[in-house]
């Protein structure tokens, strides 16, 4: 009696169980009563990552540099190419089909945590005594200049966006 189900790594065709092609190979012809399934390796730019009965291999992903992508891991006959973003960029989504610049922290904010491939920059407000006058994805809040150590006095107070302005001591006060 012909089978109605086949073992793992087999498929049912024409009332008989044929072996699936192994990862990295595509189906050329189904098995018969007298012959085994015929499979052929995928070409250099192609892959199949499962036991299969596909007649065509899949094309490796192209990491388009115009979209900010670069190769993280070259594809093999059994795996797809893995793309990642160039320095200073991160993926727009899990599939990483394109990249965008890391979020910049606005003036008055500094970088608490630099972006990763899957999460954007974490910014934090500059606390009292610190400032940031630039929009940056890498710069932390910087401390106000210490006028005293330069034998100067504060002429203008600092803010979260500006450094203090130092000036000479008022000689009259001596």
């Amino acid at each position: 009696e012909p089978p109605t189900a086949c073992r793992e790594k087999q498929y049912l065709i024409n009332s008989q169980c044929c072996s699936l092609c192994q990862p990295g190979q595509k189906l050329v012809s189904d098995c018969t009563e007298f012959t085994e399934t015929e499979c052929l390796p995928c070409s250099e730019s192609e892959f199949l990552d499962t036991w299969n009965r596909e007649t065509r291999c899949h094309q490796h992903k192209y990491c388009d540099p115009n979209l900010g992508l670069q190769v993280q891991q070259k594809g093999t006959s059994e795996t797809d190419t893995i793309c990642t973003c160039e320095e200073g960029l991160h993926c727009t989504s899990e599939s990483c089909e394109s990249c965008v610049p890391h979020r910049s922290c606005l003036p008055g904010f500094g970088v608490k945590q630099i972006a990763t491939g899957v999460s954007d920059t974490i910014c934090e407000p500059c606390p009292v005594g610190f400032f940031s006058n630039v929009s940056s994805a890498f710069e932390k809040c910087r401390p106000w200049t210490s006028c005293e150590t330069k034998d100067l006095v504060v002429q203008q107070a600092g803010t979260n966006k500006t450094d203090v302005v130092c000036g000479p001591q008022d000689r009259q006060r001596a």
């Epitope: 989504s93 606005l106 904010f109 899957v118 954007d120 974490i122 910014c123 934090e124």
Partner: antibody, heavy 121, light 107 residues
Framework: QVQLVESGGGVVQPGRSLRLSCAAS????????MHWVRQAPGKGLEWVAL????????YYADSVKGRFTISRDNSKNTLYLQMNSLRAEDTAVYYC??????????????WGQGTLVTVSS | DIQMTQSPSSVSASVGDRVTITCRAS??????LAWYQQKPGKAPKLLIY???SLQSGVPSRFSGSGSGTDFTLTISSLQPEDFGNYYC?????????FGQGTKVEIK
């Protein structure tokens, strides 16, 4: 579809500890930062803690710093919140929250149903 | 920390009405703002992110606008299922903070 299921809430005395868990499914857990957000009865939302996708960095609200610890087990698709030295003001519904990630980082796109923690003597 | 202030604290409107909720940040947050809806006894749900981007699956009657410090959530034609609390959240800087909420009631 994305599912976040919290457990471990309950009634606890001040000064005691509690551990919350959150089982995640329907997305690649290991690719996303996760958060805990809480809501005291009849009050608004308060962000509590963040853990990065790989657990390499963790951040906390000042109100829980030094008392709460966020952690994750990517092999089990589970997020945790260890809460020590609990106070009455920690009484709230605690939500496990998925970060939207990538260029939408720090927006909260999926929330669990919440688990109630009551700190009372 | 950045303070988020919502107004009004509550609004009562009829089905079909246009409802507007505003959110003000204590510092410039560019467009890093989200809006959430929360129904009684339920978890919040993301409606709008990046000030004006509609989250997948959210009805187009919800829209967001604004940048810098002033933001608006608009429900163009209020539906019975839109009752609940609405919260804004700034995603510009740590720690992430929410507005105090606006209660929307159906007349």
């Amino acid at each position: 579809q994305v599912q976040l299921v919290e457990s471990g809430g309950g009634v606890v005395q001040p000064g005691r500890s509690l551990r919350l868990s959150c089982a995640a499914s329907g997305f690649t857990f290991s690719n996303y930062a996760m958060h805990w957000v809480r809501q005291a009865p009849g009050k608004g939302l308060e962000w509590v803690a963040l853990i990065s996708f790989d657990g390499s960095y963790k951040y906390y609200a000042d109100s829980v710093k030094g008392r709460f610890t966020i952690s994750r087990d990517n092999s089990k698709n589970t997020l945790y919140l260890q809460m020590n030295s609990l106070r009455a003001e920690d009484t709230a519904v605690y939500y496990c929250v998925k970060d939207a990630g990538y260029s939408s980082s720090w927006f909260f796109d999926y929330w669990g149903q919440g688990t109630l923690v009551t700190v009372s003597s | 920390d950045i303070q988020m202030t919502q107004s009004p604290s509550s609004v009562s409107a009829s089905v079909g009405d246009r409802v507007t909720i505003t959110c003000r940040a204590s510092q410039d947050i560019s467009s890093w703002l989200a809006w959430y809806q929360q129904k009684p006894g339920k978890a919040p749900k993301l409606l709008i992110y990046a000030a004006s981007s509609l989250q997948s699956g959210v009805p187009s009657r919800f829209s967001g606008s604004g940048s810098g410090t002033d933001f608006t959530l608009t429900i163009s034609s209020l539906q019975p299922e839109d009752f609940g609390n609405y919260y804004c959240q700034q995603a510009n800087s740590f720690p992430w903070t929410f507005g105090q909420g606006t209660k929307v009631e159906i007349k």
